[in-house]
């Protein structure tokens, strides 16, 4: 995020490098844009927030689900 | 339960390169990047590098030129390589775990470092 | 690059409030730096407390918080016990690289 802004609640450094399995993941976030870098945030069963790459067709594919639901 | 340790040479000859080796347990690095730290006897931290689940890096600018940072995920190895060491590189080096998301703790856990000496 | 500053030492009581700052020559620490804290215990002993400026870490006691305070990263540890003697190191996020304090030393007489 540029100096001086305040940026949301989370941000992003990187993205998980793995497919999260599609039944770990109950919610998802977008972060701000902020953010320096763009990035989902899924939320999984067991409370943990994972940042992944929007760019990825499974991120795509995975929100594109949770919105539906 | 999540532990790194790191492994290296001890003892460097100036002008040498430094090898280290952080394994990691509990965790994947396909999921965490992982830093590298040194702290010179009586001093405190420096932060050196760190590289993140894709296998992409930053480096503190200063030792850029000298600094490399790789992993071999399927080892749940990481590899901190620095060249043309000199006496004021002596240092105690930790490798830590890093999130991935700025809310929580961005070196959370922490090995129990190796003492690195250079000399001749 | 930026530097970082802590105080070198503080003393503190059990029981008391101690406040630690983390300031930064290049302007107001803010959000964005997503200040963390880390304490060193004897033997090397290193582990995160707080990270994004004020999200205690799981297991991190209920008295250490953080917060900005001015243009300041601070570490409160409200009630201080004696076992939280050590040295505390902020460190701060600049774009693509962390640089950290030269390190608090707090001593907790009692």
């Known amino acids: 995020a540029p100096m001086g802004s305040d940026p949301p609640t989370a941000c992003c450094f990187s993205y998980t490098a793995r497919k999260l399995p599609h039944n770990f993941v109950v919610d998802y976030y977008e972060t701000s844009s902020l953010c320096s870098q763009p990035a989902v945030v899924f939320q999984t069963k067991r409370g943990k927030q994972v940042c992944a790459d929007p760019s990825e067709s499974w991120v795509q594919e995975y929100v594109y689900d949770l919105e539906l639901n | 339960q999540v532990q790194l340790k790191e492994s290296g040479p001890g003892l460097v000859a100036p002008s040498q390169s430094l090898s280290i080796t952080c394994t990691v347990s509990?965790?994947?690095?396909?999921?965490?990047?992982i830093h590298w730290v040194r702290q010179p006897p009586g001093k405190g931290l420096e932060w050196l590098g760190v590289?993140?689940?894709?296998?992409?890096?930053n480096y503190n600018s200063a030792l850029m030129s000298r600094l490399n940072i790789s992993k071999d995920n399927s080892k749940s190895q990481v590899f901190l390589k620095m060249n043309s060491l000199q006496t004021d590189d002596t240092a105690m080096y930790y490798c830590a775990r890093g999130p991935l998301i700025t809310t929580e703790v961005s070196m959370d856990y922490w090995g129990q470092g190796t003492s690195v000496t250079v000399s001749s | 690059q930026a530097v970082v500053t802590q105080e070198s030492a503080l003393t503190t009581s059990p029981g008391e409030t101690v406040t630690l700052t983390c300031r930064s020559n290049t302007g107001a620490v803010t959000t964005s730096n997503y200040a963390n804290w880390v304490q060193e215990k004897p033997d090397h002993l290193f582990t995160g407390l707080i990270g994004?400026?004020?999200n205690r870490a799981p297991g991190v006691p209920a008295r250490f918080s953080g917060s900005l305070i001015g243009d300041k990263a601070a570490l409160t540890i409200t009630g201080a016990q004696t076992e939280d003697e050590a040295i505390y190191f902020c460190?701060?996020?600049?774009?693509?690289?962390?640089?950290f304090g030269g390190g608090t030393k707090l001593t907790v007489l009692g």
């Open positions: 509990g965790f994947s690095l396909t999921g965490y990047g």
């Open positions: 460190a701060l996020w600049y774009s693509n690289h962390w640089v």
């Open positions: 590289i993140w689940p894709g296998g992409g890096t």
């Open positions: 994004g400026t004020n």
